[in-house]
Amino acid sequence: EGAAQPNNSLMLQTSKENHALASSSLCMDEKQITQNYSKVLAEVNTSWPVKMATNAVLCCPPIALRNLIIITWEIILRGQPSCTKAYKKETNETKETNCTDERITWVSRPDQNSDLQIRTVAITHDGYYRCIMVTPDGNFHRGYHLQVLVTPEVTLFQNRNRTAVCKAVAGKPAAHISWIPEGDCATKQEYWSNGTVTVKSTCHWEVHNVSTVTCHVSHLTGNKSLYIELLPVPGAKKSAKLY
């Protein structure tokens, strides 16, 4: 039932959060490296949702490093100048331009691994990341539209007669709130400067036999259900209807 809240809100969450830092990657393993990549995928763009506070690894096209001339990572983040990280194989030199975020780095030495990693993804890492590989056979691109996901904080409470409020605070993107059973509901969204959204759904149940109401919050990071028993109308010793 959850801990008793002062307002009798019963916090019941569908998922117990795992606080260990997770890592996500869209990389292919070496077996998938193909010589005829040029014929199949000269340029690939991927939309990639990544949970905030996880680690992310972004990969270049699956081109064998021995065929490489230059690798360039181009990083375009909102409100910042374009950052580039380049590696020139011939001289074994790396160069950075306008790159200030120390959490965005090569996974290891670029002559061994061309992948880019973001350690502890933050909202500010929303943006476009592109790897450009220059080879004797031409240029190959792989781009990522990285969408940072922020899990909303969910609360449920009763604020007046047979009216409950469910809030999904500071989620990215906006969460969707539904109720069991359906009530007379109004939903508002509040947009924050950091790109997160707070969704507030207020519902009233006129039907007197509704005992427990459930708020279901759907979000790309996972779903949560909370429920609460509706309190009696003040002054009512008995319900209007006996069952």
């Epitope: 039932e1 008793a4 009798n8 019963l10 019941l12 569908t14 069991i180 059973p181 359906e182 036999n209 509704v210 005992s211 427990t212 109401v213 459930t214 259900s225 429920y227 028993e229 309190l231 009696p232 109308v233 003040p234 002054g235 009512a236 010793k237 008995k238 319900s239 069952y243």
Partner: antibody, heavy 114, light 107 residues
Framework: QVQLVQSGAEVKKPGASVKVSCKAS????????MHWVRQAPGQGLEWMGN????????NYDEKFKSRVTMTTDTSTSTAYMELRSLRSDDTAVYYC???????WGQGTLVTVSS | DIQMTQSPSSLSASVGDRVTITCQAS??????LNWYQQKPGKAPKLLIY???NLEDGVPSRFSGSGSGTDFTLTISSLQPEDFATYYC?????????FGQGTKVEIK
């Protein structure tokens, strides 16, 4: 931790009344509904009604409403269920359950026999 | 009142078996559902709340699924201590209504 401790077994004659108690601890008694559920021997579970200790508001199942009264004593955090005009088919284990059904009392066996 | 139709009413199974119990609500209205385990002489014990959430301390071999009006309790690998009677309960509307129960017996 939340605990619901019920009164002991009772043997009653047909036509008599029984009052079962349920003493709550480990939470704010006045903030949660208390439900009463019964189970006849070898049968399923049957909801009887509930009471909100914060206001005394009650809901009774149609089947029991003429014979049951649910009350609370907030000073001792105790809920009571009184069933009148007992019949042999009222022989059952009576349970109290808090809120949304996570916590239950151990049950009270009420035997109605002549 | 919401009627809860639970099936099967009884089943025989062996240790290690996968067991599935279903519960369906009448009237086509969405409900919030709990699953309980009851052993002889004991009070019902909450296993699953809000259809698919495992109560603290309950082994992970128990799981709940479903939404709206159709729900399922699954025991992935039956253990000796799991032989008992299982009930579903809808708590959205008054009166609370229970399924008829499913007795899980040793084969």
């Amino acid at each position: 931790q939340v605990q619901l401790v019920q009164s002991g077994a009772e043997v009653k004659k047909p036509g008599a009344s029984v009052k079962v108690s349920c003493k709550a601890s480990g939470y704010t008694f006045t903030s949660y509904w208390m439900h009463w559920v019964r189970q006849a021997p070898g049968q399923g579970l049957e909801w009887m009604g509930n009471i909100y200790p914060g206001s005394g508001s009650t809901n009774y199942d149609e089947k029991f409403k003429s014979r049951v009264t649910m009350t609370t004593d907030t000073s001792t955090s105790t809920a009571y269920m009184e069933l009148r005009s007992l019949r042999s088919d009222d022989t059952a284990v009576y349970y109290c359950a808090r809120g949304t059904g996570a916590y239950w009392g151990q049950g009270t066996l009420v035997t109605v026999s002549s | 009142d919401i009627q809860m139709t639970q099936s099967p009413s009884s089943l025989s199974a062996s240790v290690g078996d996968r067991v599935t119990i279903t519960c369906q609500a009448s009237q086509g209205t969405s409900i919030n559902l709990n699953w309980y385990q009851q052993k002889p002489g004991k009070a019902p014990k909450l296993l699953i709340y809000s259809a698919n959430n495992l109560e603290d301390g309950v082994p992970s071999r128990f799981s709940g699924s479903g939404s709206g009006t159709d729900f399922t309790l699954t025991i992935s690998s039956l253990q000796p201590e799991d032989f008992a009677t299982y009930y579903c309960l809808q708590i959205t509307y008054l009166p609370w209504t229970f399924g008829q129960g499913t007795k899980v017996e040793i084969k």
